[in-house]
């Protein structure tokens, strides 16, 4: 079959090889498409509802006066010409639209080095096929999930038109010394080759360079988080700077409420105590620097017969700090 | 099998002080925190004190500033020195040690009254 591609809206003739160029001829156009259901006949009397959508030419082409997605699919003609020669004409007809240009929306005026930042959201609406969204940076292409790099794309379908909108959400960590003024821009490449990408206006957001603070350690012991039921795990927060600031504790993402202390000891471990820890270190000077995460977890205990056991009362279960 | 033996128990006015010990004899590699617990006639056994393998200690907020954990890692063995005692530490007092992948040991346990 010969691959044709159209525009969506515009017109399109596709020839019947072999056709008398008048009639009186004998052909018939077949057409699985997604207006049909299988093969729907064509033939050059037509008449119908048909007529609206495609038609029969007098030189036996077929005329598709607009266009759509439906039209999407498989184009066969079947001619004989005077000499009773049998023609056939066999098409694969794939529709586009090229979106308008796209744009960023939401671009930060400003990045943090270090940490990760959302530089803005790439739109592209009224795309078919769908395409593709790509950022690039200082011309160059970014590859999610390397160097910092990640990328949340979303598609969405016009429930009339049938026509996509692409969003991209770019979150970059700009790395420390790194450009203070970089490049970004996003650019659509549609789902049918041989139409060139369009790209968007740059945005060039400032990069922040935060003083460096030296890194909050927390230890876990035992090593890993991992504890048998009933076992004791102690989670101490590790700040170098001088004088040491306040320590407060997140669970999950939580806050504790406990007061603020470099150590917390979980005691006698139960299945509430597991999850995630970090403490959270705030500097009178500067803002609030949370540690890594560790994450708790009860493990089966090893096999080495009989404890002392666990002595009367149920046990603390719950986080025991001073 | 970890055989854990504590002694240093007793009657002591408020205001005395008190050294409870616990060694722990057998198979005890691997250890990376030992303890005190408490619990009084009715109550809850409640946490005192830890100290870790790497040394770090903290205690209940009702102790701190009395009671001091200490350990002797030659000799397996943890303690806790009681000063200033109050009626209201009298308890049974445990100790507990914590052994990477191995549910807790418990010690029998020591009684401490304090009168007033």
């Known amino acids: 079959a010969q691959n044709i591609t159209a525009r969506i809206g515009e017109p399109l003739v596709l020839k019947c090889k072999g056709a008398p160029k008048k009639p009186p001829q004998r052909l018939e156009w077949k057409l699985n498409t997604g207006r049909t259901e299988a093969w729907k006949v064509l033939s050059p009397q037509g008449g119908g509802p048909w007529d609206s959508v495609a038609r029969v030419l007098p030189n036996g082409s077929l005329f598709l006066p607009a266009v759509g997605i439906q039209d999407e699919g498989i184009f066969r003609c079947q001619a004989m010409n005077r000499n009773g020669k049998e023609t056939k004409s066999n098409y694969r007809v794939r529709v586009y639209q090229i979106p308008g240009k796209p744009e960023i929306v939401d671009s930060a005026s400003e990045l943090t080095a270090g940490v990760p930042n959302k530089v803005g959201t790439c739109v592209s609406e009224g795309s078919y096929p769908a395409g593709t969204l790509s950022w690039h940076l200082d011309g160059k292409p970014l590859v999610p999930n390397e160097k910092g790099v990640s990328v949340k794309e979303q598609t969405r379908r016009h429930p009339e038109t049938g026509l996509f909108t692409l969003q991209s959400e770019l979150m970059v960590t700009p790395a420390r010394g790194g450009d203070p003024r970089p490049t970004f821009s996003c650019s659509f490449s549609p789902g049918l080759p041989r139409h060139r990408a369009l790209r968007t206006a740059p945005i060039q957001p400032r990069v922040w360079e935060p003083v460096p603070l030296e890194e909050v350690q927390l230890v876990v012991e035992p090593e890993g988080g991992a504890v048998a039921p009933g076992g004791t795990v102690t989670l101490t927060c590790e700040v170098p700077a001088q004088p040491s600031p306040q320590i407060h504790w997140m669970k999950d993402g939580v806050p504790l409420p406990l007061p603020p202390s470099p150590v917390l000891i979980l005691p006698e471990i139960g299945p509430q105590d597991q999850g995630t820890y970090s403490c959270v270190a705030t500097h009178s000077s500067h803002g609030p620097q949370e540690s890594r995460a560790v994450s708790i977890s009860i493990i089966e205990p090893g096999e080495e017969g009989p404890t002392a056991g666990s002595v009367g009362g149920s046990g603390l279960g719950t986080l025991a700090l001073a | 099998q970890v055989q854990l033996v504590q002694s240093g128990g007793g009657l002591v006015q408020a205001g005395g002080s008190l050294r409870l010990s616990c060694a722990a004899s057998g198979s005890v590699s691997s250890i990376y925190a030992m303890g005190w617990y408490r619990q009084a006639p009715g109550k809850q056994r409640e946490w005192v004190t830890t100290i870790t393998g790497r040394g770090i200690t903290d205690y209940a907020a009702s102790v701190k500033g009395r009671f001091t954990i200490s350990r002797d890692t030659a000799k397996n063995a943890v303690y806790l020195q009681m000063n200033n005692l109050k009626p209201e530490d009298t308890a049974r007092y445990y100790c507990?040690?914590?052994?990477?992948?191995?549910?807790?040991?418990w010690g029998q346990g020591t009684q401490v009254t304090v009168s007033s």
């Open positions: 507990k040690i914590d052994r990477r992948g191995y549910a807790p040991y």
